[in-house]
C-alpha cells in the first residue's frame, strides 16, 4: 500500500509500538495479522556447513542427544539431510524452540547446489576438524564468504571438532587465526562466537556449545524483530502441519 | 608462549574485599580461570570466564562474593572478591587455555606463580 502516515490520537489501542514498529507500514502489518488469527512462531532453521570428514552430522547427533546405538559408524551424507531438533527453553515464557536442522554435505559434488539452499532467517553452525591445525580454518573460508553472500547479517558460530585429539599447538593456531581473519573482518559473515568440542561424547564444551546456539537462536533478529516468537497467520501454521504430515507418507527413496 | 602476572594480594580483615588482576601477554583472548591453593591442600578451581567475558563459571563456595571479568583491550582478567571469609586465605594463581571457553574437558595450558592472599579473623 502507498499509504506513509497512519494517525492514531485519541484512539485507545493496547499495543506494543516497541515490538510493532511506529511506520504506517509496520502497523498495517501488524493489524493484518490481528485481523488473521496470528500465532507466535517458534521454528528456525539452523544450518551446519563445513568440509567433509570435519564431523557435522556426529556434532548434530550429540547436540540433539541421539543416543549413542544409534550413532553407529557414520556415513558420508548425501545432499541435504533435514531434521527437526525440539528444545524446551526454561524461561518466564516456559516455551518450545524448534531447529529446523540442514545438514549440508561436505563432498565436493554438492558445492554447487548448497548456496541455493542457504537462507536469511537461519543461524549457521561453520564446522571443521581441530586437529588438524589452521589450514582447516583456512578450507573454511569458502563456506563463510558463501554464507556472506546469501544471508549476510544471519548469525554464525564456528565449531572445532575432535577436540579431544588436538593438541595446545593446534589450538592455540586455529584460535590465532580466527582471531586475526576472521572475527568482525569485512568480507566474512557475522561470526558470533566459537568453540572447540569433541563431537563424539557429552561434555562441558558440547554444553557450552548447545546454550550459545540457543541463545543466539532467541536473540536473532531481523529489521529489529526477532526472528523466533514472530507473530505468522495461524492458516499457515495448519498448512505447514499438513505439509509435514504428508512429507511422512513419501516414500524413503523418492 | 603466554605469560600470566598475577597482583593484588595482601592482607585483609574477614568481610573485606580484595580485586585479583591477571595480565596476559600475547595477542589471543584465551579462556582465563583462577584457582586457588591452601596449605596442605589440593589446588581447587575458583572462577573462569571465557574470550568474551560473556559466560562465566564458579565454584559454589564463592557463588555471590566473587565476580571474575575481563578487559581485553588490556589483557586482564579480574577477580572481585567481596566477603572474604578466613576459609579464603590461599595462593591464588591464574591460568588460561588456549580455547575460547572454559572447557572442564582440558587441563590449563598456563600458569601464573601466584599472589597470596590472607583473610584474617
Known amino acids: 500500500s502507498k499509504i506513509w502516515d497512519l494517525p492514531l490520537d485519541e484512539l485507545h489501542l493496547n499495543f506494543d509500538f516497541k515490538h510493532i514498529g511506529c511506520k504506517a507500514k509496520d502497523i498495517i502489518r501488524f493489524l493484518q495479522q490481528r485481523l488473521k488469527k496470528a500465532v507466535p512462531y517458534n521454528r528456525m532453521k539452523l544450518m551446519i556447513v563445513g568440509n567433509t570428514g570435519s564431523g557435522k552430522t556426529t556434532l548434530l547427533q550429540q547436540l540433539m542427544k541421539t543416543k549413542k546405538s544409534d550413532l553407529g559408524m557414520q556415513s558420508a551424507t548425501v545432499g541435504i539431510d533435514v531434521k527437526d531438533w525440539p528444545i524446551q527453553i526454561r524461561d518466564k515464557r516456559k516455551r518450545d524452540l524448534v531447529l529446523n536442522v540442514w545438514d549440508f554435505a561436505g563432498r565436493e559434488e554438492f558445492y554447487s547446489t548448497h548456496p541455493h539452499f542457504m537462507t536469511q532467517r537461519a543461524l549457521y553452525l561453520a564446522v571443521y576438524d581441530l586437529s588438524k591445525g589452521q589450514a582447516e580454518v583456512d578450507a573454511m573460508k569458502p563456506w563463510l564468504f558463501n554464507i556472506k553472500a546469501r544471508a549476510s547479517s544471519s548469525p554464525v558460530i564456528l565449531v572445532g571438532t575432535h577436540l579431544d585429539v588436538s593438541d595446545e599447538k593446534q589450538r592455540k593456531a586455529c584460535m590465532s587465526k580466527i582471531t586475526k581473519e576472521l572475527l568482525n573482518k569485512r568480507g566474512f559473515p557475522a561470526i558470533r562466537d566459537y568453540h572447540f568440542v569433541n563431537a563424539t561424547e557429552e561434555s562441558d564444551a558440547l554444553a557450552k556449545l548447545r546454550k550459545t546456539i540457543i541463545n543466539e537462536s532467541l536473540n536473532f533478529k531481523i529489521r529489529d524483530q526477532l526472528v523466533v516468537g514472530q507473530l505468522i497467520p495461524d492458516c499457515y501454521v495448519e498448512l505447514e502441519k499438513i505439509i509435514l504430515s504428508e512429507r511422512k507418507n513419501v516414500p524413503i527413496e523418492f | 608462549q603466554v605469560q600470566l602476572v598475577e597482583s593484588g594480594g595482601g592482607l585483609v580483615q574477614a568481610g573485606g574485599s580484595l580485586r585479583l588482576s591477571c595480565a596476559a601477554s600475547g595477542d589471543v583472548n584465551y579462556a582465563v580461570g583462577w584457582f586457588r591453593q591452601a596449605p596442605r591442600k589440593e589446588r581447587e578451581f575458583v572462577a573462569a570466564?571465557?574470550?568474551?567475558?560473556?559466560?562465566?563459571d564458579y565454584t559454589d563456595s564463592v557463588k555471590g562474593r566473587f565476580t571474575i571479568s575481563r578487559d581485553n583491550a588490556k589483557n586482564t582478567v579480574y577477580l572481585q572478591m567481596n566477603s572474604l571469609k578466613p576459609e579464603d586465605t590461599a595462593v591464588y594463581y591464574c591460568?588460561?587455555?588456549?580455547?575460547?571457553?572454559?572447557?572442564?574437558?582440558?587441563?590449563?595450558?598456563?600458569w601464573g606463580q601466584g599472589t597470596q592472599v590472607t583473610v584474617s579473623s
Open positions: 570466564i571465557n574470550w568474551r567475558g560473556d559466560n562465566t
Open positions: 591460568a588460561a587455555k588456549s580455547a575460547p571457553y572454559w572447557y572442564s574437558d582440558i587441563a590449563p595450558d598456563y
